[in-house]
């Protein structure tokens, strides 16, 4: 499974698109900054076996895809960039699904560490709650865009684990 290579490229493309999606200066939104409690320890791949790393990566990307597929998101971003970004995420999800199938000898490995998956889900729940409380304002979306860039950057740590354990 050549996930590490394809996923790194896809992740880089997603980050570039997310950067291009910025519509307002982050400096004008400093008052809206928020600590979402990114579960950084969940991206320390040393605690994971390969399938579990794949599973956490998928969770991160699926939740990001969910977030950017809402009607509120459609209203907030430039459509062609949003579509390209979403397509990139979808492609990564497909790659990760295929990887589970292609990996030999992973059958007895648990697919997940439930605590890690729940930590990622709660993180995205906090993001969704923040957007709701801020009534999906342009600054709120800008803060979230910056946060997702940060979380996608962190997910590269998990990709390194996959590369190391190939």
């Amino acid at each position: 499974c050549d996930l590490p290579q394809t996923h790194s490229l896809g992740n880089r493309r997603a980050l570039i698109l997310l950067a291009q999606m910025g519509r307002i200066s982050p400096f004008s939104c400093l008052k809206d900054r928020h600590d979402f409690g990114l579960p950084q320890e969940e991206f320390d791949g040393n605690q994971f076996q390969k399938t579990q790393a794949i599973s956490v990566l998928h969770e991160m990307i699926q939740q990001t895809f969910n977030l950017f597929s809402t009607e509120d998101s459609s209203a907030a971003w430039e459509q062609s960039l949003l579509e390209k970004f979403s397509t990139e995420l979808y492609q990564q999800l497909n790659n990760l699904e295929a990887c589970v199938i292609q990996e030999v000898g992973m059958e007895e490995t648990p697919l997940m560490n439930e605590d890690s998956i729940l930590a990622v889900r709660k993180y995205f729940q906090r993001i969704t709650l923040y957007l709701t409380e801020k009534k999906y304002s342009p600054c709120a979306w800008e803060v979230v865009r910056a946060e997702i860039m940060r979380s996608l950057s962190f997910s590269t740590n998990l990709q390194k684990i996959l590369r190391r354990k190939d």
Epitope: Q62, S69, Y90, I101, L111
Partner: antibody
Framework: EVQLLESGAEVKRPGSSVRVSCRAS????????ISWVRQAPGQGLEWMGR????????NYAQNFRGRITITADKSPLTAYLELSSLRFEDTAVYYC???????????????????WGQGSLVTVSS | EIVLTQSPGTLSLSPGEGATLSCRAS???????LTWYQQKPGQSPRLLIY???SRATGVPDRFSGGGSGTDFTLTISRLEPEDFAVFYC???????????FGQGTKVEIK
Amino acid sequence: EVQLLESGAEVKRPGSSVRVSCRASGDTFSSYPISWVRQAPGQGLEWMGRILPALGVTNYAQNFRGRITITADKSPLTAYLELSSLRFEDTAVYYCASPSADIIPSILGTTLFAFWGQGSLVTVSS
Amino acid sequence: EIVLTQSPGTLSLSPGEGATLSCRASQNVSRHYLTWYQQKPGQSPRLLIYGGSSRATGVPDRFSGGGSGTDFTLTISRLEPEDFAVFYCQSYHSPPPVYTFGQGTKVEIK
């Protein structure tokens, strides 16, 4: 919880087309695929294809390519199945089905059907 | 293309007995992507087991799934009257996404 509501029963002539709709309500996400699965009388289940409403991306089973079109609206979240060049053997109950966003981990979510419509009977008869 | 073959076609048992249903794949299937459904007459299928062995919400613990590679089983430890139905196994393969169902096993009252 997701509810899937399909359109009513149809009677069609051989060679014609049918369009079945499936409206989703509840905790829906356009970022999860909606599939169509059919069941001929007294027979098993057969996956026909799926659509990802968020992007309009479709995947079709080999058996139906060239005859099947799946489309979707994002608001309200609705999927449509169109099957053309109908034959007698297309007489079946057509189900729409979707994964669950609650399945942990999400990587299993799209590999299964957690929610099913009530089914729409399509009868092909001359 | 993967073919799933379920056996037996029909299983005649009494309430209280145990049942073992088999699902055999024509090639290796990830157990993580193996799912079981129950369908009663006139009803839509219901998700029972996913990921090979995880029970769906509300499914009693008398249902269990197991197996790997090409051989998978659904076990019902003690049949209750409401368990009699047709059971289907289903696998997922990607890319491109393909969902395959077995032909079903009918568990009927003896």
